[in-house]
């Protein structure tokens, strides 16, 4: 969490941002809140980005003002106009691109004063893994697949029964570039698995960590997946 205060003029207002990550090709949110004002027409929101000539987005007098919007962001940004009055200056960013990563500034002017806060935005690709039994293999084998990751992640297998065991000798991981030449499909195979055990396939890069679990018994197979973003810090 980053909390910024205005430093110029007689009055300052508190602006709060939260560092976050965007999944390329999908929509993302850059979070920013501020001390609300009672009059929408008195609120100015400016989003700026380090290295960008011009503005990422500007909202003033109750509407978007995009005359200085940089071409990199044209047609891809929106504020939640109905929530500005209650202090929400968050920016919706459509079709997140790798190049959107960087340091953003949320700058607010209201009748009470000015304030700003920076936000670190990371971009990459992350997806939920799915673990299945590979019935085509000669021995009991598990196959963990996740369709989109970037940058290249690490893959680690773990087992509930053999906690702390190193499975690198009995697993094989490959990365296949997807058609857009940036993200990659992750495939990891674990050999010599035993039944009545729960195995976890953990995929991690500097943006996200995802885990796919599979429990194999003689009577059933249970699966569970979850994904966690690693860098959500408020400022």
């Amino acid at each position: 969490l980053i909390i910024g205060f205005g430093i110029s003029g007689r009055h300052s207002i508190t602006v709060t941002t939260v560092a976050s990550a965007g999944n390329i090709g999908e929509d993302g949110i850059l979070s920013c809140t501020f001390e609300p004002d009672i009059k929408l027409s008195d609120i100015v929101i400016q989003w700026l980005k380090e290295g960008v000539l011009g503005l990422v987005h500007e909202f003033k007098e109750g509407k978007d003002e995009l005359s200085e919007q940089d071409e990199m962001f044209r047609g891809r940004t929106a504020v939640f106009a109905d929530q500005v009055i209650v202090g929400n200056a968050s920016l919706r960013l459509k079709n997140v691109q790798l190049t959107d990563a960087g340091t953003y500034k949320c700058y607010i002017i209201t009748s009470k004063g000015k304030g700003n806060a920076n936000l670190e935005y990371k971009t990459g690709a992350f997806s939920m893994p799915e673990v299945n039994v590979d019935y085509n293999a000669s021995s009991e084998t598990l196959r963990c697949e996740a369709p989109r990751w970037f940058p290249q992640p690490t893959v680690v297998w773990a087992s509930q029964v053999d906690q702390g065991a190193n499975f690198s000798e009995v697993s094989n991981t490959s990365f296949e570039l997807n058609s857009e030449n940036v993200t990659m499909k992750v495939v990891s195979v674990l050999y010599n698995v035993t039944i009545n055990n729960t195995y976890s396939c953990m995929i991690e890069n500097d943006i996200a960590k995802a885990t796919g679990d599979i429990k194999v018994t003689e009577s059933e197979i249970k699966r569970r997946s979850h994904l966690q973003l690693l860098n959500s810090k408020a400022s």
């Epitope: 380090e50 290295g51 000539l53 011009g54 503005l55 005359s67 200085e68 919007q69 940089d70 071409e71 990199m72 044209r74 691109q97 790798l98 190049t99 959107d100 990563a101 960087g102 971009t123 030449n181 940036v182």
Partner: antibody, heavy 115, light 107 residues
Framework: EVQLVESGGGLVKPGGSLKLSCAAS????????MSWVRQTPEKRLEWVAG????????YYSDTVKGRFTISRDNVRNTLYLQMSSLRSEDTAMYYC????????WGQGTSVTVSS | DILMTQSPSSMSVSLGDTVSITCHAS??????IGWLQQKPGKSFKGLIY???NLEDGVPSRFSGSGSGTDYSLTISSLESEDFADYYC?????????FGGGTTLEIK
Amino acid sequence: EVQLVESGGGLVKPGGSLKLSCAASGLTFSRYAMSWVRQTPEKRLEWVAGISSGGSYTYYSDTVKGRFTISRDNVRNTLYLQMSSLRSEDTAMYYCGREYGRDYWGQGTSVTVSS
Amino acid sequence: DILMTQSPSSMSVSLGDTVSITCHASQGINSNIGWLQQKPGKSFKGLIYHGTNLEDGVPSRFSGSGSGTDYSLTISSLESEDFADYYCVQYAQFPRTFGGGTTLEIK
């Protein structure tokens, strides 16, 4: 067809001034952030200054800050670079171009600073 | 400032060859990199932007790749019009900075 045509270069004495122009046609000039880049006689490239699409935001390299001023006229579709207190190390071919190294570049105008 | 180290500074190659030019940034630039071509006595032509995107009208034998601090421009099956100077430029931060250039010469 997109065209960027620079003019205003020439021979000038150290301490002198020049104003470069870059006339744009064939593109919606007001949509794009623009830059001036220079190429030294040794072929080294140096970014000089940039300006936002509407002209309110400008950035300069440290080597020219306080001496050069970038501006634009979106009605006349023209980018400018006012250069003052010129030094011998400002000698270069000056190019205007669309920001981010994207396509559209002018053919350049030569600036020589020498006594 | 971000330092862009480009290599090689020159290379002698033959028609039909595949060549790669690399640029190393002194810090991560999140694919905020472009590649430019300059023919002798001429201006610049943008080839690649955002690390991997081909500018309109640029032949598909040109491709860009890389992430973090390391990026490359690859030209497959070189044609006679490809013999020129090539530069990378980063636009993650101000000031924009360029690589030192690579001259492709006919062997």
